[in-house]
Interface confidence: medium
């Protein structure tokens, strides 16, 4: 349930037990469309998309990234390792998606939908990986303090953080999409 909402506002989902690859593919493409809309607002509002100072802000963030060892790339592809990485990465992105809430004016619904749709995607992938126990969930206390820290940044850093989260999340999802199509 999004922050500040009553659960009665949300139609509780009853998802089918089996989630096809096509459905997961569609869910990711749907989230990517949402990210595009959010990036459009971010880029229109500030010059962050052309900024060369990304490295300054990137040092503050520990955004999930795909690496060779994760087994998601064509070379050294490993279905199990990769699936664990995708789920773990999405779980780690959740705190950053929480940060994005209230960061948008004309795209408020898109920001909330990206967050909600990511939760659903995680559910789908967890079903697919039901026999994998190597998935670690981020510590809620650590997430809470990270969120507080991000929200306490100055305006320029907050804008840069928003831009970096969207860019990294887009790249992570695109890599995930390519990898999941191999599974």
């Amino acid at each position: 349930v999004p922050p500040g909402e009553d659960s009665k506002d949300v139609a509780a989902p009853h998802r089918q037990p089996l989630t096809s690859s096509e459905r997961i593919d569609k869910q990711i493409r749907y989230i990517l469309d949402g990210i595009s809309a959010l990036r459009k607002e971010t880029c229109n509002k500030s010059n962050m998309c052309e900024s060369s100072k990304e490295a300054l802000a990137e040092n503050n963030l520990n955004l999930p990234k795909m690496a060779e060892k994760d087994g998601c790339f064509q070379s050294g592809f490993n279905e199990e390792t990769c699936l664990v990485k995708i789920i773990t990465g999405l779980l780690e992105f959740e705190v950053y998606l929480e940060y994005l809430q209230n960061r948008f004016e004309s795209s408020e619904e898109q920001a909330r939908a990206v967050q909600m749709s990511t939760k659903v995607l995680i559910q789908f992938l967890q079903k697919k990986a039901k026999n994998l126990d190597a998935i670690t969930t981020p510590d809620p206390t650590t997430n809470a303090s990270l969120l507080t820290k991000l929200q306490a940044q100055n305006q320029w850093l907050q804008d840069m953080t928003t831009h970096l989260i969207l860019r990294s999340f887009k790249e992570f999802l695109q890599s995930s999409l390519r990898a999941l199509r191999q599974m």
Epitope: P2, G4, E5, D6, K8, D9, V10, A11, P13, R15, Q16, R23, K26, R29, Y30, D33, G34, A37, E105, S106, E108, E109, Q110, R112, A113, M116, S117, V120
Partner: antibody, heavy 122, light 108 residues
């Protein structure tokens, strides 16, 4: 309990105007996009117009563009549809509908009002 | 003409399975939602996001989507399931579109 109650319908002559209202309760109105959907007698559902949660973004079906205006007053938890230059083909039951959370591009309507009848006839 | 195509009518024997289809090019990348409408009443959401059921909707209602076709399945149709069913999605210009509706008759 979520409730949507439409009012303002009635009989109007072609070329006339009407303003529909939809009073919302039981949910955080200011955080939900809303739509108007109509249904002509014996026909299917037709989307008319939508407005985002803050009221800054609106969209309209081609059949009503330039004649109808959707608006909202979040302080009063009320959605409006101002209908001008009405035509006989606008005759329908007009429903106010709350958009669910899971979509922004493909919104679904998880709650509907009971509808208000608009008849355009001379 | 609707951008989403549904059969105008369908009959099913009590207790049997009814499958209502909804066809449209946009359904390959957009979600389909389904509504049930009984005479003189407002529509009720029965399936959203292709295959998800809101709370309070019986388990006999399920949904699926593949390519450009969405399907609403009612397994073990009951007399109270008789009514009109509409699929809904969005077109490329972000406008909401409804299918023309399917009248389901449950033969008892």
């Amino acid at each position: 309990e979520v409730q949507l109650v439409e009012s303002g319908g009635g009989l109007v002559q072609p070329g006339g105007s009407l303003r529909l209202s939809c009073a919302a309760s039981g949910f955080t109105f200011s955080r939900n996009a809303m739509s108007w959907v109509r249904q002509a007698p014996g026909k299917g559902l037709e989307w008319v117009s939508a407005i985002n949660s803050g009221g800054g973004s609106t969209s309209y079906a081609d059949s009503v563009k330039g004649r109808f205006t959707i608006s909202r007053d979040n302080a009063k938890n009320t959605l409006y549809l101002q209908m001008n230059s009405l035509k006989p083909e606008d005759t329908a039951v007009y429903y106010c509908a709350k958009e669910g959370y899971t979509g922004w591009k493909d919104p679904m309507y998880d709650y509907w009002g009971q509808g208000t009848q608009v008849t355009v006839s001379s | 003409q609707s951008a989403l195509t549904q059969p105008s009518a369908l009959s099913v024997t009590l207790g049997q399975t009814a499958k209502i289809t909804c066809q449209g090019g946009s359904l390959g990348s957009r979600y389909a939602h389904w509504y049930q409408q009984k005479p003189g009443q407002a529509p009720v959401l029965v399936i959203y996001d292709d295959d998800s059921r809101p709370s309070g909707i019986p388990e006999r209602f399920s949904g699926s989507s593949s390519g450009g076709r969405a399907t609403l399945t009612i397994s073990g149709a009951q007399a109270e399931d008789e009514g009109d069913y509409y699929c809904q999605s969005a077109d490329t210009s972000e406008h909401i579109v409804f299918g023309g509706g399917t009248h389901l008759t449950v033969l008892g």
